[in-house]
Interface confidence: low
């Protein structure tokens, strides 16, 4: 004979009563309302509990707010239950016991039918935990109660001096939702916000929580999946300015269900979207998509921004959302990657996209475009990558998908085939008016479109030429010469710290520019057009630095310790990051500052060329750096612009060197026997190539590396031709996280910054 | 090497059972889906079963429906058909078979790699 | 669910072309684009040459070829040579998670 193992389980709830209605006095705790109607709540809800078979279970409860509807009463309980009953007395069960009391005639005088005139059908039961309340106990010194009006935007004000963290009930009518927005207004802060699909901080019902002040969302708008909300907001800091701003109002219910047919043509037709986006999508959600194809075809193309999809093994809960497409079960997951899912269509009555919200933690809204694809050729030109669904160039010498497929049984990688022998020619020779292949394959179909491929040159109007790198030749090479539009670049000027180098003269790098902080040199860029800047994503990587506010760019410049004629600055009135950039693996490392106003070229300030996608820099190739970084490793920088030549290097070569830590946005240039490099102050700087038509184009960003010219130990530079898409993007204003724009980082140990 | 080894094959009375295993190696076994196909003497090739990687989704031929039960031990690499009520036309050699790679993991229903195969023979 | 039909032999010289039908129903060949064909050499496991209609694996031979029109699928040797004396599948999906097979064709290179 042993003592029965009891379990304490915690539940949370409300339960409406008709008869009575709520005043502001019961919103405040300290009232002497609020500890009446508690007490006599207390009591009703005892013996409610009691009158079940609960009753010999009951431990203790509390009734810990008050809420309109006509009055509404939050609660919780716990219950000793015998542990072999523990998983019979789920919250639908204990909801089914105390509604079949509330609908019995059992014991008419209770005062659950005197004195308070309770709805079975408002009785909410939810499961709780010990922490749950101890959250909620600690936050009830702070407790404010809201109903929320339709049309109306309240504002909260975050917890004063006295008190650390508060707790916001919130409450909105029936038929709508629930939106909190939250809005930075300063760069620092260490405060924490957590917000709950239900009345009080219950773990299990955790919407999402931010701590910080995030640059990536200036605004975040976050969806309860009903009409109630609680909000916990913790001080870090204290100060007199609330570091962010957070309202609420109440918004209709939005339908996301939709029925599409698609037009027989390969462009991105549409978007689907989560309700309210980009708000938060409500732990609610359940959207469905139908959408129809023209034939057969045709697949369907799904293209997410930071987002993709996987199966899910052992069928667990999709965390970040829930995708059937075709009666396939996929969990949707954030990534600073892009992504696209293809979507064969093996019938002709169409294909259905649910997207379901499995837990109540949601994340950003999702946004995803849609387009077809011909089956039978998806990827024309370049290949499929089936890891991400995305048509990447093949055989160029850089494993663009994850498994190198695209870089596997290639006759000739980084070159060209000829079609009489399979044999390999470089590519600067193909279209050069000099035979090089048997029959001379190499220098046929030079002036007429070609299918496009990975180096051939896209036209704007879509069709491809085969010379390779035919921008800005002096040539028409496309049929509408766009080839040889946006060419008053990469030119230097009338004249003639890096490790290693030499000091430059005046106009030799028109395109070099100077960020600086309070006169203080910190990174290098290049001018790409009269009003942007491209330089280095890490370079804002410090929350102190992370406002453009703060940043001044100097052109023109040769000596930092010393002003002349021919230099000009500029404040920044917007900073774009790419949206993928990683701090830790320093993917991504591009941004692009706009400038308060146009620059007006001159011999000492002009812009460098930006290479097309399918621009081919030739492993091998001499190309030059500048700046003003320092000129040994630990060093400090150097006071006149710098210049050094390095040799660019076969992916694979430096891929070994850093243990395949290079991604295929990155570029490696220097020597085996290291001395010429960047280094500190040279981050953003452009690495800069000269094509035989002496135009330079820009081939990298100083991006990473270990140490400052150390043998074995090449540069690593952002690889300009594949972030070329984003920067063009952002250019012509359709797109970048702007105004702000990195994630919260951590320091990668290994690497020192140039 | 890409390889499937059926075992378990042999001579079973009419009305008794037997179980067949298919051992893989050299792929990702929980990546795939796998079949069971077979071949009367002299016949055609009969698709028998099919099981998705996470054994979610089955499927059987109508002539095996409610005597064969397929299943799948990811953790040990193991493809199994369980064959009950045996009848003589269920005589064949027995293929287990691999569902090509899927690029996006559906089901292309087709089986790029195929065992031996394993005789049963069901006769009194 | 029943077989797809498939004639039970053909043949063709060294060089030439020929042709093996595969008919189903609405509900296979004719509703879905998984149409596979396979070769089978004697006392041999069978191999795949073409999926998904008309696509070929790697190693298959470009003298293979498949197609679709209506509910009839079709394989495509050119170039016959005498390695390519097998018999020949073809399968369908045929939904509800059920695949079914052809009869099979006999192939003979003549002379």
């Known amino acids: 004979y042993k003592a029965e193992v009891t379990i304490s389980q915690v539940y949370s709830g409300s339960l409406r009563v008709l008869n009575r209605h709520f005043s502001q006095d019961l919103a405040r705790r300290e009232s002497i309302a609020f500890r009446t109607e508690t007490a006599k709540a207390q009591k009703m809800f005892q013996e409610l509990v009691a009158s079940t078979r609960l009753g010999t279970y009951y431990n203790s409860s509390s009734i810990y707010a008050f809420g309109e509807g006509p009055l509404i009463c939050f609660f919780w309980f716990i219950l000793d239950i015998p542990e072999y009953q523990r998983l019979t007395l789920s919250p639908e069960v204990v909801r089914e016991l105390l509604v079949g009391e509330l609908l019995s005639n059992s014991s008419a005088l209770a005062s659950y039918r005197t004195e308070y005139e309770v709805d079975p059908e408002g009785l909410v039961i939810l499961e709780a935990s010990v922490n749950d309340i101890v959250v909620l106990n600690s936050t009830l010194g702070c407790y404010r109660y809201s109903y929320v009006n339709p049309g109306q935007v309240l504002r909260l004000r975050g917890p004063d001096q006295q008190t650390t963290s508060c707790l916001w009930h919130l409450q909105g009518p029936e038929d709508l939702m629930l939106k909190v927005q939250l809005e930075w207004t300063r760069v620092d802060c260490r405060d924490r916000v957590a917000m709950y699909d239900a009345a009080g901080p219950l773990e299990k019902r955790l919407i999402t929580s931010v701590y910080g002040c995030s640059r990536q969302e200036p605004v975040m708008e976050v969806l309860a999946s009903g009409s109630v909300m609680a909000v916990v907001w913790k001080k870090g800091l204290h100060s007199f300015y609330d570091p962010f701003l957070l309202s609420v109002k109440s918004v209709a219910f939005q339908d996301c269900q939709v029925n599409l047919t698609l037009e027989g043509r390969l462009d991105p037709q549409g978007f689907l979207r989560t309700p309210y986006y980009p708000s938060y999508y409500s732990p609610s959600t359940h959207c469905s998509w139908h959408l129809t194809v023209p034939s057969l075809d045709y697949g369907l193309a799904l293209w997410f921004d930071a987002y993709a999809l996987r199966r899910q093994k052992y069928n667990l809960l999709c965390t970040q959302g829930q995708w059937m497409i075709q009666n396939r079960r996929l969990c949707g997951f954030r990534t600073l990657q892009p992504y696209a899912e293809r979507i064969p269509v093996v019938a002709s009555d169409g294909i259905t996209i649910n997207f379901t919200s499995q837990i109540s933690l949601t994340g950003p809204g999702v946004q995803v475009y849609y387009s077809l694809y011909n089956q039978s050729d998806p990827c024309p030109g370049e290949f499929l990558c089936s890891v991400n669904g995305l048509c990447v160039p093949a055989c160029d010498g850089i494993k663009d998908c994850p498994n190198g497929l695209d870089e596997r049984n290639c006759v000739c990688r980084a070159m060209f085939q000829c079609q009489e022998d399979s044999t390999c020619i470089s590519l600067p020779r193909v279209c050069d008016r000099q035979p090089d292949c048997l029959n001379g394959s190499d220098e046929e179909q030079c002036q007429e479109g070609v299918p496009c491929g990975t180096f051939t040159f896209q036209c704007e109007d879509r069709s491809c030429v085969k010379k390779p790198n035919p921008e800005c030749d002096g040539q028409a090479d496309c049929r509408d010469g766009s080839d040889e539009e946006h060419c008053d670049c990469g030119l230097q000027g009338p004249s003639s710290r890096i490790v290693g180098g030499a000091m430059s003269s005046e106009g030799e790098w028109p395109w070099q520019a100077s960020l600086q902080i309070r006169g203080r040199h910190i990174c290098g860029g290049a001018l790409i057009a009269d009003r942007w800047v491209i330089t280095a994503a890490h370079c804002f990587q410090e929350d102190s630095m992370a406002s453009p506010r703060l940043w001044t760019v100097f052109l023109g410049k040769m000596r930092q310790n010393s002003r002349w004629p021919g230099e000009v600055s500029f404040k920044v009135s917007r900073l774009f990051l790419h949206p993928y950039h990683e701090e830790d693996s320093h993917d991504y490392d591009v941004a692009l500052l706009q400038l308060d106003h146009p620059v007006v070229y001159s011999a000492t300030v002009r812009p460098v060329c930006l290479p097309a996608r399918s621009h081919f820099f030739e492993p091998g190739q001499h190309c030059w750096i500048t700046g003003w970084g320092a000129q040994r490793e630990g060093g400090p920088g150097s006071s006149t612009l710098q210049k050094v030549d390095v040799q660019l290097i076969p992916q694979d070569l430096c891929n070994e060197a850093y243990r395949y830590q290079v991604t295929p946005r990155m570029l490696c240039a220097g020597y085996r026997k290291g001395k010429k490099d960047a280094c500190q102050g040279d981050s953003g700087g452009p690495l800069v190539c000269k094509e035989p038509s002496g135009r330079w184009f820009l081939a990298g960003l100083v991006s990473w590396g270990l140490g400052c010219g150390r043998p074995n130990f090449f540069g690593v530079y952002t690889r300009v031709t594949r972030v070329v898409n984003w920067i063009q993007q952002v250019l012509t204003g359709g797109g970048g996280s702007g105004g702000g724009g990195s994630h919260h980082h951590h320091h990668h140990g290994s690497h020192h910054h140039h | 090497e890409v390889q499937l080894v059926e075992s378990g094959g042999g001579l079973v009375q009419p009305g008794r059972s037997l179980r067949l295993s298919c051992a893989a190696s050299g792929f990702t076994f929980d990546d795939h889906v796998m079949y069971w196909v077979r071949q009367g003497p002299g016949k055609g090739l009969e698709w028998v079963s099919g099981i998705s990687w996470n054994s979610d989704t089955i499927g059987y031929a109508d002539a095996v429906k409610g005597r064969f039960t397929i299943s799948r031990d990811n953790a040990k690499n193991v493809l199994y058909l369980q064959m009950n009520s045996l009848r003589p036309e269920d005589t064949a050699l027995y293929y287990c078979a691999r569902e090509k790679d899927g690029d996006f993991y559906y089901n292309y229903f087709v089986m790029d790699v195929w065992g031996q195969g394993t005789t049963v023979t069901v006769s009194s | 669910q029943s077989a797809l039909t498939q004639p039970p032999s053909a043949s063709g010289s060294p060089g030439q072309s020929v042709t093996i039908s595969c008919t189903g129903t609405s509900s296979d060949v004719g509703f879905y684009n998984f149409v596979s064909w396979y070769q089978q050499h004697p006392d041999k496991a069978p191999k795949v040459m073409i999926y998904?209609?008309?696509k070929r694996p790697s190693g298959v031979p470009d003298r293979f070829s498949g197609s679709k029109s209506g509910n009839t699928a079709s394989l495509t040797v050119s170039g016959l040579q005498a390695e390519d004396e097998a018999d020949y599948y073809c399968?369908?999906?045929?939904?509800?998670?059920?695949?079914?097979f052809g009869g099979g064709t006999k192939l003979t290179v003549l002379g």
């Open positions: 998904e209609v008309s």
């Open positions: 399968s369908s999906y045929a939904g509800s998670n059920k695949v079914v």
